[in-house]
Interface confidence: medium
């Protein structure tokens, strides 16, 4: 083979092998979620997880997220707060 | 080296180099989230973000998502609406 | 070219080609979300999706997630339950 056609062949092979490795790796990425429930008006996600939603006791649907990790239920006298926590899982 | 064993060596090298690049790239992927709050009964996520949950004023827990980007709080006379917005961050 | 400099050239080419393939693949990863609404107090996400948040009828903001796939609204006499369901989309 000439160097030129060899270069083409190597390029093709890289595309093939790397492509299939990438496809397998990307396909295995998932979204891993868990719930954390705490007494009172605050619930904090584990390190490395992001808050995607919050739930509150007493039917309360008003909440905010503090420091990107903690659910805060805004209704008075909250008995419990829950955080829905997710992360990308390779 | 024969062309055949050279091909094998190249394949192995592709697996190694591509594998390490892929591992690095996949390992750095994270979930980035932010909150958007608006007056009224609608709150829209920035471009590129997906709605993962909504929150509403007046303790309201009833909402729906419009056009995959906007939180809509369903209770009457909503003073504010919040959207929890997330995206995969390379 | 010597085998040594050829090896270096191949390594460089793998880095280049695989690197750009990986960048494109990673850049195209997104968060795909959808809503599922059901009558009653339970709503289940499709296979492969994770629950990121829940919504309930009657303004109820109290919910929990069962088996990581199902939203359960906790207020009495729920007329409907909604699940916000997301997955990483290559």
């Amino acid at each position: 083979k000439t160097l030129c056609s060899m270069e083409e062949a190597i390029n093709e092979r890289i595309q093939e092998v790397a492509g299939s490795l990438i496809f397998r790796a990307i396909s295995s990425i998932g979204l891993e979620c868990q719930s954390v429930t705490s007494r009172g008006d605050l619930a904090t996600c584990p390190r490395g997880f992001a808050v995607t939603g919050c739930t509150c006791g007493s039917a309360c649907g008003s909440w905010d997220v503090r420091a990107e990790t903690t659910c805060h239920c805004q209704c008075a006298g909250m008995d419990w707060t829950g955080a829905r926590c997710c992360r990308v899982q390779p | 080296k024969t062309l055949c064993s050279m091909e094998e060596a190249i394949n192995e090298r592709i697996q190694e180099v591509a594998g390490s690049l892929i591992f690095r790239a996949i390992s750095s992927i994270g979930l980035e989230c932010q909150s958007v709050t608006s007056r009224g009964d609608l709150a829209t996520c920035p471009r590129g973000f997906a709605v993962t949950g909504c929150t509403c004023g007046s303790a309201c827990g009833s909402w729906d998502v419009r056009a995959e980007t906007t939180c809509h709080c369903q209770c009457a006379g909503m003073d504010w609406t919040g959207a929890r917005c997330c995206r995969v961050q390379p | 070219k010597t085998l040594c400099s050829m090896e270096e050239a191949i390594n460089e080419r793998i880095q280049e080609v695989a690197g750009s393939l990986i960048f494109r693949a990673i850049s195209s990863i997104g968060l795909e979300c959808q809503s599922v609404t059901s009558r009653g107090d339970l709503a289940t996400c499709p296979r492969g999706f994770a629950v990121t948040g829940c919504t309930c009828g009657s303004a109820c903001g109290s919910w929990d997630v069962r088996a990581e796939t199902t939203c359960h609204c906790q207020c009495a006499g729920m007329d409907w339950t909604g699940a916000r369901c997301c997955r990483v989309q290559p």
Epitope: R47 | S28, E32, Q89 | -
Partner: antibody
Framework: EVQLLESGGGLVQPGGSLRLSCAAS????????MSWVRQAPGKGLEWVSS????????NYADSVKGRFTISRDNSKNTLYLQMNSLRAEDTAVYYC?????????WGQGTLVTVSS | DIQMTQSPSSLSASVGDRVTITCRAS??????LNWYQQKPGKAPKLLIY???YLQSGVPSRFSGSGSGTDFTLTISSLQPEDFATYYC?????????FGQGTKVEIK
């Protein structure tokens, strides 16, 4: 060539404050998470804090949570660590490191001594 | 937090020796295991990431293996510049945690 240069270390009394800086060059700073790792004299390595590329997400070791604040200025290619309520056990060499998973590049370190 | 346990804590070896250091995680961390070399007064240097991937510029006498909870760093033929302290670190779960270190000394 990737370079990370820490500054701001020194001697401080217990309860005092210090602000460490890390000037980065040789890579696209705004595209990478960054971390602080410390090493007490004669001891092993301890992760302290990390911050995402955009600065929206931060993580802290339990031993420093509520006392230390990590931040970054992507326009200046600089990472910061604000350390308040310092204790004797915070005495260490503080390294800034690129990434928040495998730390592929490290600065030379800056010594923080907490003593009365 | 995940505990990382290295063994041995120190070892004596000669130039040319094959050296093996092990690291055990308190729970499975898949392949999220990194190895660093540190010389006195210097910053650590990444040798291996992802359990087995050689960091750019690191000599091929260094290799890593393992997955799950048990990992190994091998130096196939010890060189004078390899006498240092070696740390493993897991990056599978926050917070990142390091092993206590293994000091490789001249026999």
């Amino acid at each position: 060539e990737v370079q990370l240069l820490e500054s701001g270390g020194g001697l401080v009394q217990p309860g005092g404050s210090l602000r460490l800086s890390c000037a980065a060059s040789g890579f696209t700073f705004s595209s990478y998470a960054m971390s602080w790792v410390r090493q007490a004299p004669g001891k092993g390595l301890e992760w302290v804090s990390s911050i995402s590329a955009s600065g929206t997400s931060t993580n802290y070791a339990d031993s420093v949570k509520g006392r230390f604040t990590i931040s970054r200025d992507n326009s200046k290619n600089t990472l910061y660590l604000q350390m308040n309520s310092l204790r004797a056990e915070d005495t260490a060499v503080y390294y800034c490191a690129k990434s928040n998973s495998d730390f592929d590049y490290w600065g030379q370190g800056t010594l923080v001594t907490v003593s009365s | 937090d995940i505990q990382m346990t290295q063994s041995p804590s120190s070892l004596s070896a000669s130039v040319g020796d094959r050296v093996t250091i092990t690291c055990r995680a308190s729970q499975s961390i898949s392949s999220y295991l990194n190895w660093y070399q540190q010389k006195p007064g210097k910053a650590p240097k990444l040798l291996i990431y992802g359990a087995s991937y050689l960091q750019s510029g690191v000599p091929s006498r260094f290799s890593g293996s393992g997955s799950g909870t048990d990992f190994t760093l091998t130096i196939s033929s010890l060189q004078p510049e390899d006498f240092a302290t070696y740390y493993c670190q897991q990056s599978g779960y926050d917070p990142a945690t390091f092993g206590q270190g293994t000091k490789v000394e001249i026999k």
